[in-house]
């Protein structure tokens, strides 16, 4: 056979469909690889050919379009299953060709099973709802093109094993599910089952999505730097380790990039000729507010380092903030002696205990690891 532009196996399109349900799969050539659509190709005399490779086989075979009740059919650039079977799983290829042109792409199709509570290996889309924000809706996804607008399907919504009925704040409204007010308890997997008739048969489409209730933009604030702060002084002797945590709270903001960084004397740590390491940890609240901690560490601090300016910066879509850490060189404690011996240098003991940092205005001392949460 003559040469064909082979786009290979398009693993980006990991198509998953439920067993015993209709599936319509568009040839990815027109979606992602070619600059023209099927209608243009068809009117230019190009033919779309489908074939497949079964799971765990190497042999490419034609798709059988002569099955009872037209179980598998092709319509324009769409491959139809009415319905799927488990052993339809495999790699499918669509090839567009005529005598002078050929282009093809393969994609994996996985037919998956679900249990009575709609659990399955299906990857679920996530829909975020704002907490206590007023009415918000989710819509039953990917059901377009399965039935004409003249057909009125029945739609049933479930949360896990349970039909959504008599819920306090969740109301099924056809293809939409309305949340009158969203709470944390509304987190979970929601399934719509769309039932429609076709040629004397009844088909079901099952679509599950995950709802995640997140912080509301009404409550969103610019980043808040909890540490460093005005109450903590990082007082060190040369040769000691300097550890300064920068802990920043970010309100949840849809599609916002949260950033935290240190500057030393106004420069990025990488641009300073000292041995600095920065470790970052991130934690999230139940509503996806974020706390980022970046710990700046200098293993053996020099007196030069103790004169530098250490500033923590934070930025989100809500704004940018910065806070300098108060770093000082520890003044050696005066040596008090008691005539006649026997006594201990009580003041000296106090200074020894005050090894790491002063909390101004308090008289308490805390070792640095208390501030790394």
């Amino acid at each position: 056979s003559e040469r064909c532009d082979d786009w290979g196996l398009d693993t980006m399109r990991q198509i998953q469909v439920f067993e015993d349900e209709p599936a319509r799969i568009k040839c990815p050539l027109f979606e992602h690889f070619l600059k023209f659509n099927y209608s243009t190709a068809h009117s230019a005399g190009l033919t779309l050919i489908w074939y497949w490779t079964r799971q765990d086989r190497d042999l490419e075979e034609p798709i059988n379009f002569r099955l009872p009740e037209n179980r598998i059919s092709k319509e324009k650039d769409v491959l139809w299953f009415r319905p799927t079977l488990l052993n339809d799983t495999g790699n499918y290829t669509c090839m567009l060709r005529n005598t002078t042109y050929c282009s093809k792409v393969a994609f994996p199709l996985e037919v998956v099973q679900k249990d009575s509570c709609f659990n399955s290996p299906m990857k679920l889309p996530v829909h975020k709802l704002y907490i206590e924000y007023g009415i918000q809706r989710i819509t039953c996804p990917n059901v377009d093109g399965y039935f004409p607008s003249s057909v009125k399907p029945t739609i049933t919504w479930y949360m896990g094993c349970y039909k959504i009925q008599n819920f306090n704040n969740v109301i099924p409204e056809g293809m939409n599910l309305s949340f009158l007010i969203a709470f944390i308890s509304n987190n979970g997997n929601y399934t719509c089952v769309v039932t429609y008739p076709e040629n004397g048969r009844t088909f079901h489409l099952t679509r599950t999505l995950t709802v995640k209730v997140v912080g509301s933009p009404k409550n969103a604030v610019p980043p808040v730097i909890h540490s460093p702060n005005d109450h903590v002084v990082y007082e060190k002797e040369p040769g000691e380790e300097l550890l300064i945590p920068c802990t920043v709270y970010f309100s949840f903001l849809m599609d916002s990039r949260n950033e935290v960084w240190w500057t030393i004397d106004g420069k990025k740590p990488d641009d300073i000729p000292i041995d600095v390491t920065i470790n970052e940890s991130i934690s999230h609240s139940r509503t996806e507010d974020e706390t980022r901690t970046q710990i700046l560490s200098i293993k053996k601090v020099t007196s030069e380092d103790l004169k530098r300016s250490y500033v923590c910066h934070a930025r989100s879509a809500k704004g940018e903030v910065a806070k300098a850490a108060t770093v000082k060189q520890k003044v050696p404690a005066p040596r008090y002696t008691v005539e006649g011996g026997g006594g201990t240098g009580g003041l000296n003991d106090i200074f020894e205990a005050q090894k790491i940092e002063w909390h101004e205005g308090g008289g308490h001392h805390h070792h640095h690891h208390h501030h790394h949460h």
Epitope: D115, S116, M159, C161, Y162, G188
Partner: antibody, heavy 122, light 107 residues
Framework: QVQLVQSGAEVKKPGSSVKVSCKAS????????IQWVRQAPGQGLEWMGY????????DYAQKFQGRVTITADESTSTAYMELSSLRSEDTAVYYC???????????????WGQGTLVTVSS | EIVMTQSPATLSVSPGERATLSCRAS??????LAWYQQKPGQAPRLLIY???TRATGIPARFSGSGSGTEFTLTISSLQSEDFAVYYC?????????FGQGTKVEIK
């Protein structure tokens, strides 16, 4: 360890109502359903209905529609099953049961209460 | 609603012997079937779900099989504590329904 503790035995007159309580200890963070099942003396198990306390959702078996009301008080982790217009054939042990989540197929009756005997007699 | 029919109503077995209990659904319930054990004066206890998966803490002598409309619970070697009533339950369709039970008694 999750436990369900039910209220004590009741003797009721025909035509009256009974309200059985079921208190959960060690409740999980995520929503769950409380099921109600009854068992007449020497008979099998009969599902009556459920409630999802944190979400308010409920449903009843067709046979009990109009006579049963299942409610819950989230603040005390207690569910209630009220059966009205009692007749002698409602004499049974009434059980509450629950699973850990709303999603575990076949495991919605993981944990059971000890049962409450309701006797309907004139 | 789906009707679950268990057989036999009573099964007389000697300790150490194998017991086989049947459950039939009036229509396919796929693998959405559970088995429960109930001893006198006690609440039921979940043994098997998903037709063949043992619940937490259930001994390996209990096994379930089947799918669609025909299901079996097998107790490979009956212990004295296994003499009880066993119920099957389908959770494929609402309302979830139980069988009428099989009593396993000492022969």
């Amino acid at each position: 360890q999750v436990q369900l503790v039910q209220s004590g035995a009741e003797v009721k007159k025909p035509g009256s109502s009974v309200k059985v309580s079921c208190k959960a200890s060690g409740s999980p963070a995520e929503p769950y359903a409380i099921q109600w099942v009854r068992q007449a003396p020497g008979q099998g198990l009969e599902w009556m209905g459920y409630i999802i306390p944190s979400l308010g959702g409920y449903d009843y078996a067709q046979k009990f529609q109009g006579r049963v009301t299942i409610t819950a008080d989230e603040s005390t982790s207690t569910a209630y099953m009220e059966l009205s217009s009692l007749r002698s054939e409602d004499t049974a042990v009434y059980y509450c049961a629950r699973g850990q989540t709303l999603y575990a197929a076949g495991r919605q009756f993981d944990i059971w209460g000890q049962g409450t005997l309701v006797t309907v007699s004139s | 609603e789906i009707v679950m029919t268990q057989s036999p109503a009573t099964l007389s077995v000697s300790p150490g012997e194998r017991a086989t209990l049947s459950c039939r659904a009036s229509q396919s319930v796929s693998s959405n079937l559970a088995w429960y054990q109930q001893k006198p004066g006690q609440a039921p206890r979940l043994l098997i779900y998903g037709a063949s998966t043992r619940a937490t803490g259930i001994p390996a002598r209990f096994s379930g099989s089947g799918s669609g409309t025909e299901f079996t619970l097998t107790i490979s070697s009956l212990q004295s504590e296994d003499f009880a009533v066993y119920y099957c339950q389908q959770y494929n369709n609402w309302p979830w329904t139980f069988g009428q039970g099989t009593k396993v008694e000492i022969k």
